[in-house]
Interface confidence: low
């Protein structure tokens, strides 16, 4: 897939530098498994440059292939607490809206660990909203070096 | 944040291709939790292109947002050895100098695992020195496919 | 390492946008530890743009430094199943051909976890074929959000 002649001649910025790194704001109410994120220099080292937040969920504003990465650390955790339940605590990153594009992109279980971290390349489209669902009764750490979520546009 | 007119007109290289992938050289003396890194083609597949090493610690030479990634594997490890202590073995990546910018960027505990791996996007400035602190008595593997640390400049 | 004058003047695409994200197709026969991958829009969110597949193994078509990432989740897994064996289930990503360049790039053991995920920067050359070897008796999940493998060209 080659860049169009127009793309080749546009300034570099038009190719997309969209990037975001978010920190945990809070968890959802009882029946809402979503993590709610926040970003901005006033909060520390988090930022949004292109993507935006919609009620704590990350919305994409430029089509392209993105590197999506996440780390979530459980706040009050021992190796036994994560393996105590029949259904282990699980983190899933997915497109949650528009509904027509709803899909799970990345899924990890904690098993006997207290931190999960992963990353993947995935095509995303303008308007896609990414949700991060943490199922189970364990709470995530809000420490900015332990729990974070980000995306980086890497190519059209 | 848009690229300046000057940046748009400069050759691509001036936007920053700074990148490094390092392998473990050695651990610090008794009271020094830092890991000491090395890089260069003569050592294998590690390299430094832009950033530099200062006494085994990685120093940034170009402002920008970086993808920082790390994997550390404990050398002599079983799932029980990593959970033996009240304070589990922990790996933290942070800016350790200049002191005014000292902050923890990334933190993981081994719990019942023997490898941690993660990555994150973070703004770094010229002169920032990154330190990787491994607390606990367990030693890291020096195998180049098990323990490595790298940064990649991704945008201004 | 600076870009050549010719590279500076070529359209952006010529610098390399090679990228791939693959999903698991199947495991190898009894004595073959390799995982076999597949990619393409018809299969879901996997794709190949530059690299190619050769009998389920990923072949690089452009020299450069690549970010290689992988996540593998074991299909039928508990924390006891992964720690039962003297030699734990291990995942290794390496260059398997040409033979002269054969090397392990990335290695992780599952220990008491059921998912491994990591990433690293590494120089790759045109013609390098990457193999992902899963040793042990446990089978990987074929869910596309649990097991995936990708590469991204990041600089010459």
């Amino acid at each position: 897939q080659r860049l169009s002649r127009a793309q080749q001649q546009l300034p570099l910025e038009s190719l997309g530098w969209d990037i975001a790194e978010l920190q945990l704001n809070h968890t959802g109410p009882q029946q809402d498994p979503r993590l709610y994120w926040q970003g901005g220099p006033a909060l520390g080292r988090s930022f949004l440059r292109g993507p935006e937040l919609d009620k704590g969920q990350l919305r994409i504003r430029r089509d392209g292939i993105y590197m999506v990465h996440i780390q979530v650390t459980l706040a009050i955790c021992s190796s036994t607490s994560t393996s105590r339940h029949h259904h282990p605590t699980t983190l899933a990153v997915g497109i949650c809206s528009p509904a027509s594009r709803s899909i799970s992109l990345l899924r990890l279980s904690f098993h006997q660990g207290c931190t999960i971290a992963s990353q993947r390349l995935t095509p995303l489209a303008r308007g896609d909203t990414l949700c991060t669902n943490l199922t189970g009764t364990l709470l995530p750490s809000r420490n900015t070096d332990e729990t974070f979520f980000g995306v980086q546009w890497v190519r059209p | 944040q848009r690229l300046s007119r000057a940046q748009q007109q400069l050759p691509l290289e001036s936007l920053g291709w700074d990148i490094a992938e390092l392998q473990l050289n050695h651990t610090g003396p008794q009271q020094d939790p830092r890991l000491y890194w090395q890089g260069g083609p003569a050592l294998g597949r590690s390299f430094l292109r832009g950033p530099e090493l200062d006494k085994g610690q990685l120093r940034i030479r170009r402002d920008g947002i970086y993808m920082v990634h790390i994997q550390v594997t404990l050398a002599i490890c079983s799932s029980t050895s990593t959970s033996r202590h009240h304070h589990p073995t922990t790996l933290a990546v942070g800016i350790c100098s200049p002191a005014s910018r000292s902050i923890s960027l990334l933190r993981l505990s081994f719990h019942q695992g023997c490898t941690i791996a993660s990555q994150r996007l973070t703004p770094l400035a010229r002169g920032d020195t990154l330190c990787t602190n491994l607390t606990g008595t367990l030693l890291p593997s020096r195998n180049t496919d098990e323990t490595f640390f790298g940064v990649q400049w991704v945008r201004p | 390492q600076r870009l050549s004058r010719a590279q500076q003047q070529l359209p952006l695409e010529s610098l390399g946008w090679d990228i791939a994200e693959l999903q698991l197709n199947h495991t190898g026969p009894q004595q073959d530890p390799r995982l076999y991958w597949q990619g393409g829009p018809a299969l879901g969110r996997s794709f190949l743009r530059g690299p190619e597949l050769d009998k389920g193994q990923l072949r690089i078509r452009r020299d450069g430094i690549y970010m290689v990432h992988i996540q593998v989740t074991l299909a039928i897994c508990s924390s006891t199943s992964t720690s039962r064996h003297h030699h734990p289930t291990t995942l290794a990503v390496g260059i398997c051909s040409p033979a002269s360049r054969s090397i392990s790039l990335l290695r992780l053991s599952f220990h008491q976890g059921c998912t491994i995920a990591s990433q690293r920067l590494t120089p790759l050359a045109r013609g390098d074929t990457l193999c992902t070897n899963l040793t042990g008796t446990l089978l990987p999940s074929r869910n596309t959000d649990e097991t995936f493998f990708g590469v991204q060209w990041v600089r010459p």
Epitope: - | A75, H85, L139 | -
Partner: antibody, heavy 122, light 112 residues
């Protein structure tokens, strides 16, 4: 400071049983693996057994396997060695030693007790 | 089981002079992770053993830097750069690669 104090030694007839104790103080006992090591009079050291911090794993020397049982009570900060079917060759000073945490198989005995003498004789 | 041997079994030394003790194992103690599973202990007369070296070459906390460990695979050496009177006693190596752990027979170091 870290202290390990063995007790329970004495003279016992062959075929009989004895239980040794090792009382720990000065550190968080439940965080560490502990070993038993013995030394016959005028002889060298012989590793006997190890127990993990939480009692989940136990390993024994072939010479005592099936006869000796290592156990611990973390609530009492105490390690035990139950010795059954004692033989003359079990005569030794028995030391408990804390594992320093340097390896998955618990090598590195960084603190030792003073030892307790067990004499198996008719 | 892995068998450990030491030589010499007795080593008369002169204070201020160097000394070295050899330890051999019946199979390699080098793990695939690059570390050798061999420790050294010193038992001074009338005392419990004390920890000197772990993983072949790493000094335990508080051990003077005149003690050093080296070697790999099956052949290991404990060196004392300048012997002091307080260094007398029996030196033991132990393999911790696999259970059962096994000690060497010991090397008795005393002053000439």
């Amino acid at each position: 400071q870290v202290q390990l104090v063995e007790s329970g030694g004495g003279v016992v007839q062959p075929g009989r049983s004895l239980r040794l104790s090792c009382a720990a103080s000065g550190f968080t006992f439940s965080n560490y693996g502990i070993h038993w090591v013995r030394q016959a009079p005028g002889k060298g050291l012989e590793w006997v057994a190890v127990i993990w911090y939480d009692g989940s794993n136990k390993y024994y020397a072939d010479s005592v396997k099936g006869r000796f049982t290592i156990s611990r009570d973390n609530s009492k900060n105490t390690l035990y060695l139950q010795m059954n079917s004692l033989r003359a060759e079990d005569t030794a000073v028995y030391y408990c030693a804390r594992d320093g945490g340097y390896s998955g198989y618990d090598s590195g005995f960084d603190y030792w007790g003073q030892g307790t003498l067990v004499t198996v004789s008719s | 089981d892995i068998v450990m041997t030491q030589s010499p079994l007795s080593l008369p030394v002169t204070p201020g002079e160097p000394a070295s003790i050899s330890c051999r194992s019946s199979q390699s103690l080098l793990n695939s992770n690059g570390y050798n599973y061999l420790d050294w202990y010193l038992q001074k007369p009338g005392q419990s053993p004390q920890f000197l070296i772990y993983l072949g070459s790493y000094r335990a906390s508080g051990v003077p830097d005149r003690f050093s460990g080296s070697g790999s695979g099956t052949d290991f050496t404990l060196r004392i750069s300048r012997v002091e009177a307080e260094d007398v006693g029996v030196y033991y190596c132990i393999q911790t690669l696999q259970t059962p752990f096994t000690f060497g027979p010991g090397t008795k170091v005393d002053i000439k």
